[in-house]
């Protein structure tokens, strides 16, 4: 999933993966 939300039962925080594309491709040379 692109974003993780909520907390687990041990009160851990979730890391947000929202800063990165879910299925990234290589940059094209222009």
């Amino acid at each position: 999933s692109e974003t993780t939300t909520g907390t687990s039962s041990n009160s851990s925080q979730s890391t947000s993966n929202s800063g990165l594309a879910p299925n990234p491709t290589n940059a094209t040379t222009k």
């Epitope: 979730s14 890391t15 993966n17 990165l20 491709t25 290589n26």
Partner: antibody, heavy 115, light 112 residues
Amino acid sequence: EVKFEESGGGLVQPGGSIKLSCAASGVTFSEAWMDWVRQTPEKGLEWVAEIRDRETKYVTYYAESVKGRFTISRDDSKSRVYLQMNNLRTEDTGIYYCTGAMDYWGQGTSVTVSS
Amino acid sequence: DIVMTQTPLSLSVTIGQPASISCKSSQSLLYSNGKTYLNWLQQRPGQSPKRLIYQVSKLDPGIPDRFSGSGSETDFTLKISRVEAEDLGIYYCMQGTYLPWTFGGGTKLEIK
């Protein structure tokens, strides 16, 4: 409190190997996409490698400059991510940070490649 | 690779005054899902980087709302509405749309 702690850095000769480790706490590690980023005065911040989560089949991505030399891996049971660095070059010198998809960052561990 | 160009290289701001940093990417960062993966990071002296903003304008938890991000496609801006002493450090833009992820060269914010 979220904490990422890197270890394993040090001085290594060109052509040598070293393995970095990052221990995470206070975070749902199994869901986090984990990256290694290095920092040097010359090149600034430079992304090195990424490993994603179980849901994405632990897919890995690498910077071209380290492909075939570095291997990123993770152990969700230990909340740890690793970076195995082989055939090291002087240009691999820098501070290596582990980060949860650029969200949380560790304090970094220094790697110096020199003869 | 996507080249991220930041301006200015450094700026000196009086406490309470605004500050603005520009970041330009060599290609559009708009992803196929309609989202734009442009992040802003802060690195205080002697510390590791810390993300402030993701997806152009979304503030990370605990980040003061004096920070804001805007822009689209290739042109992005980080604004601090009222600079505080704790804001000194280096600010980086970073793109997460295309591999390899790339960072700007950084903008050093100094306090007058």
